[in-house]
């Protein structure tokens, strides 16, 4: 596979309303205009699919209606945000980038993005 | 139903321009990428380049760099490939060509294709 | 450039007799990545050209099963069970594992 390198930020805090945004860039070795982006979560050495989109340079990246990811694309990096995210969802967030068209075919990995998640505390009870 | 329709056939001096219209319909324009090819008369297939119709921006064949021009206007859904410099062996079809990302970036839909006969 | 070399050039078929096109690539179109970038067109008389197959055996929509493609990565079989009229044409390999896209030669399959 040719290699292809991916930045993306090493810590990532949740907001208290549970959404994540980072950004994944990587270094494009030609035209690359066709996309795919895939988000990954490693924990415990288990590796899930979160989500992923595929985008023409130019067009919009779009997920599937009923995923927690969204995401802008500008050049050569993705904007990303994961939403609905609960502390039993911290763990490393690994974006994967593949160069699909025009061939060859390119591959990158980052080193993924610790998201730490925090549940908000629930608010006391007033007696006003 | 998808379909591509080609501009008509085209007589050209050597040296002059020519240049090609593919108008798309039945699918969204701007989420496909436009690919030209060249069929010498009675012989095989050559690709051209192709056109990326959300920024305009395109991979050409060496062999054809610098006198294929592509170019889309996505207000009418439209795709074209000037070629300059004509020469006796420009005499060919020319098609344009869907590609699809299912299909792995095969071509699965292409124009009736455009007779272009170079001749003074 | 990659080149594609199909053979025969020229293939009499009986209607209801199976078919057999070669063709072979100057480099491996198998990518690390699992996909062989291998594509088999058919151009009927007085037609634009027409998808049969890609990544080497996936039939296109509306494609019969009659036919079928098979391969390595640099030797590859298009096949067709049993040949029917309407089989007639010219059929192309094409390759997309890296630019310039190119194409075989063509093996023309016309009726005995």
């Known amino acids: 596979c040719k290699a292809m390198h991916v930045a993306q930020p090493a810590v990532v805090l949740a907001s208290s309303r549970g959404i994540a945004s980072f950004v994944c860039e990587y270094a494009s070795p030609g035209k690359a205009t066709e996309v795919r982006v895939t988000v990954l979560r490693q924990a415990d050495s288990q590796v899930t699919e979160v989500c992923a989109a595929t985008y023409m340079m130019g067009n919009e990246l779009t997920f599937l209606d009923d995923s927690i990811c969204t995401g802008t694309s500008s050049g050569n990096q993705v904007n990303l945000t994961i939403q609905g995210l609960r502390a039993m969802d911290t763990g490393l967030y690994i974006c994967k980038v593949e160069l699909m068209y025009p061939p060859p075919y390119y591959l990158g990995i980052g080193n993924g993005t610790q998201i730490y998640v925090i549940d908000p505390e629930p608010c006391p009870d007033s007696d006003f | 139903q998808v379909q591509l329709v080609q501009s008509g056939a085209e007589v050209v001096k050597p040296g002059a321009s020519v240049k090609i219209s593919c108008k798309a319909s039945?699918?969204?324009?701007?989420?496909?990428?436009i690919n030209w090819v060249k069929q010498n008369p009675g012989q095989g297939l050559e690709w051209i380049g192709d056109?990326?119709?959300?920024?305009?921006?395109?991979n050409s064949n060496q062999k054809f760099e610098g006198r294929a021009t592509l170019t889309v206007d996505t207000s009418i859904s439209t795709a074209y490939m000037e070629l300059s410099r004509l020469r006796s062996d420009d005499t060919a079809v020319y098609y344009c060509a869907r590609l699809r990302r299912e299909y792995f970036y095969a071509m699965d839909y292409w124009g009736q294709g455009t007779l272009v006969t170079v001749s003074s | 450039d990659i080149v594609m070399t199909q053979s025969p050039l020229s293939l009499p078929v009986t209607p209801g007799e199976p078919a057999s096109i070669s063709c072979r690539s100057s480099?491996?179109?198998?990518?690390?990545?699992?996909?062989?970038?291998l594509y088999w067109y058919l151009q009927k008389p007085g037609q634009s050209p027409q998808l049969l197959i890609y990544q080497m055996s996936n039939l296109a929509s509306g494609v019969p099963d009659r036919f079928s493609g098979s391969g390595s990565g640099t030797d590859f079989t298009l096949k067709i069970s049993r040949v029917e009229a309407e089989d007639v044409g010219v059929y192309y390999c094409a390759q997309n594992l890296e630019l310039p896209l190119t194409f075989g030669g063509g093996t023309k399959v016309e009726i005995k």
């Open positions: 480099k491996s179109l198998l990518h690390s990545n699992g996909i062989t970038y």
């Open positions: 056109i990326n119709p959300n920024n305009g921006g395109t």
């Open positions: 039945g699918y969204k324009f701007t989420d496909h990428f």
